[in-house]
Interface confidence: low
């Protein structure tokens, strides 16, 4: 099994606590308002804690239509969120899973940095192409910025 690691850092003028609340704790209610149409549907199995599954269907027309996320850990004190992508065509047929570690770091100006470390566990010696990483980063950035704009407005 291969392992690839990618880091995405996004800065925000919104505080780490507020981003964490919207991005992690209240994501299921905030995201549909912040980015309507980002998801076609979300089916939640579980209570929101570790082990909870989110079966996500994305809008038609994109390269990815399905993904299943498993919540691995939410630490409100440390502002960390761990989750894994464990199923769906997002895995491209050669990725076993994508382990994600998100941490919100407060900055001196009252804003925050959202640092996501994504660890791709691939089958055999398969390598995730750079264009796929770039696409994922663009989607995640767009989603984050939509969420940030919503939190600033509300």
């Amino acid at each position: 099994m291969g392992v690839q690691t990618h880091v995405l850092e996004l800065t925000s003028s919104v505080s780490a606590e507020k981003i964490f609340q919207g991005f992690v704790i209240d994501v299921d209610t905030v995201l549909p308002k912040a980015a309507p149409g980002a998801y076609k549907s979300v089916e939640i199995k579980g209570d929101g804690g570790p082990g909870t599954l989110k079966i996500i269907t994305l809008p038609d027309g994109g390269p990815i239509t399905t993904m299943t996320l498993r919540i691995d850990g939410v630490n409100k004190e440390a502002l960390t969120f761990d989750y894994s992508v464990i199923d769906g065509d997002i895995l491209l047929g050669f990725i076993e899973s994508i382990e994600n570690h998100v941490v919100l770091v407060p900055t001196a100006d009252g804003g925050s940095i959202c640092k996501t470390t994504a660890i791709f566990h691939t089958k055999g010696d398969a390598v995730v192409p750079e264009e796929n990483i770039k696409y994922a980063n663009e989607q995640n950035t767009a989603l984050f910025k939509a969420l940030e704009a919503y939190l600033i407005a509300n």
């Epitope: 392992v3 690691t5 004190e77 502002l79 570690h101 770091v105």
Partner: antibody
Framework: QVQLVQSGAEVKKPGASVKVSCKAS????????MHWVRQAPGQGLEWMGW????????NYGQKFQGRVTMTRDTSITTAYMELSRLRSDDTAVYYC?????????????WGQGTLVTVSS | DIQMTQSPSSLSASVGDRVTISCRAS??????LNWYQQKPGKAPKLLIY???NLQSGAPSRFSGSGSGTDFTLTISSLEPEDFATYYC?????????FGQGTKVEIK
């Protein structure tokens, strides 16, 4: 102040297992990942894996997968590293090391080390 | 895996000397580079994290610079307690890997 206190030196035979403990104090145990790093005599440092002390989730270096098990007991703020099917080249000092903030994979605090000698 | 190569592997210097140690990564690791000091029989100690941030409690004579693939640890004026082995470590991509170490000895 932050302290990581490891269990004492061990001598093991090839094929046996060893379990090293790391008792943490002086901080919120579940707020920081714990890593294990080893150092063979006269050699450099080698990362073995981490445990998310909050969830118990682990990530092992590929070299050690199938032989290493990392666990924790939050009630006594202690992390454990067990290495099985020991070989002579596993002779090393084993360190636990705590992440600097949450988990940014910077090893801020280290245990004093546990020497594991594998010899027949 | 990302290979970390330090140079030199050892150096001799005198108290008061300015010392620089280099660390090169086999691929771009942005600023995810950390430096540790280790004395014989002791655990490593964090000196610099994420290329240029001085760890709390580390003396200000230590500084770090660089990004991408090339990094430097500088000791502005060597003190007797600085004779030790120094390791760089990348925290960009699993597995986290260390350089082979640079031993700073008394001339």
């Amino acid at each position: 102040q932050v302290q990581l206190v490891q269990s004492g030196a061990e001598v093991k035979k090839p094929g046996a297992s060893v379990k090293v403990s790391c008792k943490a104090s002086g901080y919120t145990f579940a707020a920081h990942y714990m890593h294990w790093v080893r150092q063979a005599p006269g050699q450099g440092l080698e990362w073995m894996g981490w445990i998310n002390t909050y969830t118990g989730g682990t990530n092992y270096g590929q070299k050690f997968q199938g032989r290493v098990t990392m666990t924790r007991d939050t009630s006594i703020t202690t992390a454990y590293m067990e290495l099985s099917r020991l070989r002579s080249d596993d002779t090393a000092v084993y360190y636990c090391a705590r992440d600097r903030r949450n988990w940014n994979f910077v090893f801020e605090y280290w245990g004093q080390g546990t020497l594991v000698t594998v010899s027949s | 895996d990302i290979q970390m190569t330090q140079s030199p592997s050892s150096l001799s210097a005198s108290v008061g000397d300015r010392v620089t140690i280099s660390c090169r990564a086999s691929q771009n690791i942005k600023n995810y580079l950390n430096w540790y000091q280790q004395k014989p029989g002791k655990a490593p100690k964090l000196l610099i994290y994420e290329a240029s941030n001085l760890q709390s409690g580390a003396p200000s004579r230590f500084s770090g610079s660089g990004s991408g693939t090339d990094f430097t640890l500088t000791i502005s004026s060597l003190e007797p307690e600085d004779f030790a082995t120094y390791y760089c470590q990348q925290s960009f991509s699993i597995p986290w890997t260390f350089g082979q170490g640079t031993k700073v000895e008394i001339k």
